[in-house]
Amino acid sequence: MMTGTIETTGNISAEKGGSIILQCHLSSTTAQVTQVNWEQQDQLLAICNADLGWHISPSFKDRVAPGPGLGLTLQSLTVNDTGEYFCIYHTYPDGTYTGRIFLEVLESSVAEHGARFQIP
């Protein structure tokens, strides 16, 4: 039975040209995290694997940095980066947990962080 929950940074906004940290945290489970995949829509951004370390997908290498922790840092943001981001936790024995973050990249300096929320 899957008992864990994923807490994410929720709905966030950031300025064009700036950077943002995408963070997810898995709690309330003793399951072993095998791998965390970061995806934007259906595109693979990055992988963090317990045995093999970090991998940033080739098309994002220039603008994506691993960490902090299992999180992901997006740099040199453009308005095209606006959209949904998913952290996918592959765990044993629970299975797969998915967290969702919505990022809005703004032209002006009105960017402010949204509230944290949970996805069971």
Partner: antibody, heavy 120, light 110 residues
């Protein structure tokens, strides 16, 4: 179409060297962990070596450690196996295989194999 | 000597259900995922089951995988003559840090 094509298999004398290649096509090679698996005549499958996405983490079976070196050239979509100090017991069909996006899940694409014969 | 243990052979008649076992230890099957492969004579292996119980697209639902403790099994229901092949289980071993295979099971359809 997702494809793996091995080459470089040959007849070689004991103590000799050989380099196997595996050309990948139809997928983003950089995003996948790769392995070499071999099969001696009339025997079962034996894992040989594994390499992560950018080649900075490698693992080997005890039987080939310090003799074989796995590497990859992502710009050429090619996986390699450098085989040194070859022995009669290295005679086998060598397959290159792609791991599932979560590498521990399994090997989802296999090449057709290339034959290595070590004999005097 | 393989790290994972499989029976050397198994057999069944067309339409029957056959199960192939795979036994490991606490550092592989018990805490990791198992995958199963079918190898027809003279061909490369083909993935049948990944993540212990999931089927890749194109694999008939006659093939199913399960796992309990340090053992895993592959079940083939509605056995067909084209299922005659060698079957291998494999898992990542956390202690050895290596990919370990079973010795293979030769399935004969009588």
């Amino acid at each position: 179409e997702v494809q793996l094509l091995e080459s470089g298999g040959d007849l070689v004398q004991p103590g000799g060297s050989l380099r196997l290649s595996c050309a990948a096509s139809g997928f983003t090679f950089d995003d996948y962990v790769m392995s070499w698996v071999r099969q001696a005549p009339g025997k079962g499958l034996e894992w040989v070596s594994l390499i992560n996405w950018n080649g900075d983490k490698t693992y080997y079976a005890d039987s080939v450690k310090d003799r074989f070196t796995i590497s990859r050239d992502n710009s050429k979509n090619t996986l390699y196996l450098q085989m040194n100090s070859l022995r009669a017991e290295d005679t086998a069909v060598y397959y290159c295989a792609r791991h599932w996006i979560v590498f521990q899940y399994g090997l989802d694409v296999w090449g057709q194999g290339t034959t290595v014969t070590v004999s005097s | 000597q393989s790290v994972l243990t499989q029976p050397l052979s198994a057999s069944g008649t067309p339409g029957q259900r056959v199960t192939i076992s795979c036994s490991g230890v606490s550092s592989n099957i018990e805490i990791k995922y198992v995958s199963w492969y079918q190898q027809l004579p003279g061909t490369a292996p083909k993935l049948l089951i990944y993540n212990s119980h999931q089927r890749p697209s194109g694999v008939p639902d006659r093939f199913s995988g399960s796992k309990s403790g340090t053992s895993a099994s592959l079940a083939i229901s509605g056995l067909q003559s084209e299922d005659e092949a060698d079957y291998y289980c494999t898992s990542w071993d956390d202690r050895l840090k290596s990919w370990v295979f079973g010795g293979g099971t030769k399935l004969t359809v009588l």
